[in-house]
């Protein structure tokens, strides 16, 4: 067990041109707060996926009012650290999302309004117990500077918070086979209480005799790496030989436990073990009250007058989630036309149009031939949002700039030989054939099939095709 700590140092305009407008004004003063979401491993999951390692919300920062004419400075920040307690081992690799939210303090009906100013995300390696790590992330024209660390809660120590320490029983040294607990030299490493043979690198225990595995390892002693392929066995405990984890319809699938709770199957259902500060059947209840303003995007908070009673956010249309933090997928209605790609930016829908189309919903079919010339006498043909050149004889390519090889398509039939010519092509027919493309057989008696050979040309002579 331990705590991930995040210290925000500054949030303001980044370097370079295009400084962002101040998020607050004299008419609409506002204040900032931050949300951090942690996930184990180097996952690149969507922002809406569960914060399996935990999440935290900062206090509100001081009220800020823009000074007219002044450039947007670094904005005043909330006091204190953001702390995300973790109950199990620290995974060592993790993904984070840090969101900067603006709370407008104008005269909105229904209380203050929240909007997301910036979201940064990253994937990092971090050992528990190490020094503060500094980071700078940019989101658009904004820049966020912050530090973070993971520290173990006593009696846990180590880079994963899996070793246990106890005060020394003797003042001078630790017991036989036990080392001093760095950095707590006045404490000793506790005797091993895990199941015999439990991997010291990939397993840990919180109760005597157990062996719980870190992410990516399985088996009774956490010695088998998890493989996600070649898993053909029925659902059940992971195979100690193949290390396969087979998804199936178990009560813990999809982790019904919210807020970083861990799920364990029971004979009849499931049970959530909640991180500190959360409780309820699915860890859905927290010590947060409506007074803390937990509902985002104009959600209405009901109940939760004290930390022991749950609050419920009634979300406005277009938002959902326990804190109205998730936007409904408006792009599923496919508002973009002509194959445009829909992007839900929160404040608006945007369409990224395919070539040849324009407009807010890609509704305008551009005149593809406007301003486009086809070379060498070609003519421009419009169609399907893409311009095409119909090229004059002897030319090809997108803009008719390439001299075509008229023989490339093997136009001479029946083994005739093709010769390129300035006016087109010429076929030299094999014996027994004639015609511009050697398409007509010559009858054995010398007569040919229609049409007759032109005067002055014998069968077998090269036929010029114009």
């Amino acid at each position: 067990a331990g705590v991930f700590e995040l210290q925000i140092h500054s949030f303001g305009p980044g370097p370079g041109p295009g400084a962002p407008r101040s998020p607050c004004s004299a008419r609409l003063p506002c204040r900032l707060f931050f949300r951090v979401c942690l996930k184990p491993g180097l996952s690149e999951e969507a922002a809406e996926s569960p914060c399996a390692l935990g999440a935290a919300l900062s206090a509100r920062g001081p009220v800020y009012t823009e000074q007219p004419g002044a450039p947007a400075p670094d904005l005043p920040l909330p006091d204190g650290l953001l702390q995300v307690p973790f109950r199990d081992a620290w995974p060592g690799t993790f993904s984070f999302i840090i969101e900067t939210w603006r709370e407008e303090l104008g005269d909105q009906i229904g209380g203050p309004a929240w909007s997301l100013l910036a979201r940064v995300a990253g994937r990092r390696r971090l050992a528990a117990g190490g020094p503060w790590a500094r980071d700078i992330q940019r989101a658009g024209a904004w820049e966020l500077r912050f530090s973070y660390r993971a520290r173990c809660e006593p009696p846990a120590v180590g880079t994963a918070c899996t070793r246990l320490c106890r005060p020394r029983s003797a003042p001078s040294r630790c017991g036989p086979g036990l080392r001093p607990c760095a950095p707590l030299e006045d404490e000793c490493e506790a005797p091993l209480v895990c199941r015999a043979g439990c991997s010291p690198e990939h397993g840990f225990c919180e109760q005597p005799g157990e062996c719980r595995c870190l992410e990516g390892w399985t088996g009774p002693l956490c010695t088998v790496p998890v493989s996600t392929s070649s898993c053909l066995s029925p659902r059940g405990p992971s195979s100690a030989t193949t290390g396969c984890l087979v998804p199936g319809p178990g009560p813990c699938d999809g982790n019904p436990c919210a807020n970083g709770g861990s799920c364990s199957e029971t004979p009849r259902s499931f049970e959530c073990t909640c991180p500190r500060g959360f409780y309820g059947l699915r860890c859905e209840v927290s010590g947060v009250t409506c007074a803390d303003g937990p509902c985002f995007n104009g959600g209405l908070c009901v109940g939760g007058a004290d930390p022991d009673s749950a609050y419920i956010c009634h979300c406005p249309p277009g938002f959902q989630g326990s804190n109205c933090e998730k936007r409904v997928d408006r792009c599923s209605l496919q508002p973009c036309r002509n194959g445009g790609l829909c992007l839900d930016l929160g404040h608006a829908l945007r369409c990224r149009c395919r070539a040849g189309f324009a407009g807010p919903r890609c509704e305008h079919d551009l005149d593809d031939c406007a301003g486009r010339a086809c070379a060498n006498g070609g003519t421009c043909v419009e169609g399907g949002g893409a311009h095409r050149c119909s090229c004059a004889l002897g030319f090809g390519g997108r803009d008719c700039r390439e001299r075509a090889d008229p023989c490339a398509a093997r136009p001479c039939a029946h083994g005739g030989r093709c010769y390129a010519h300035f006016s087109g092509l010429v076929c030299a027919c094999a014996p027994g054939y004639m015609g511009a493309r050697c398409e007509f057989p010559v009858h054995p008696d010398g007569a040919s099939a229609l049409p007759a050979a032109p005067p002055g040309l014998r069968p077998g002579d090269p036929q010029r095709y114009l």
Epitope: L333, P335, P360, R361
Partner: nanobody
């Protein structure tokens, strides 16, 4: 400002039918896309059926063959005919529309929702 007004929700037995209506009014130049979403208790909101920006119809897999969406362009109204209703169709049904306003801007609007309950 644009308003979407839903009607037609209610309680029905499994196998029964309901017809939802959604009328759009206000400073509308044109309706680009319009349809129905639903939000079952404790779950995410999802698209049920709609007319896309290209004018084609789109249905959720779970309602294909049972629900039919139709529209009356003159009245800026869409309808959702729901047949062979099941318990899992119980939800608040929301009308949604992507509208081009008189000032040529596009905005996405939601109705307030109408409750459909399917129970024996």
């Amino acid at each position: 400002e644009v308003q979407l007004v839903e009607s037609g929700g209610g309680e029905v037995q499994p196998g029964g039918s309901l017809r939802l209506s959604c009328a759009a009014s206000g400073s509308i130049f044109s309706i680009n896309a319009m349809g129905w979403y639903r939000q079952p208790p404790g779950k995410q909101r999802e698209l049920v059926a709609g007319f896309t920006g290209d004018g084609s119809t789109k249905y959720a897999e779970s309602v294909k063959g049972r629900f039919t969406i139709s529209r009356d362009n003159a009245k800026n109204t869409v309808y959702l005919q729901m047949s062979s209703l099941r318990a899992e169709d119980t939800a608040v049904y929301y009308c949604a529309a992507d509208v081009q306003l008189l000032n040529s801007d596009y905005e996405f609007y939601w109705g307030q929702g109408t409750l459909v309950t399917v129970k024996p």
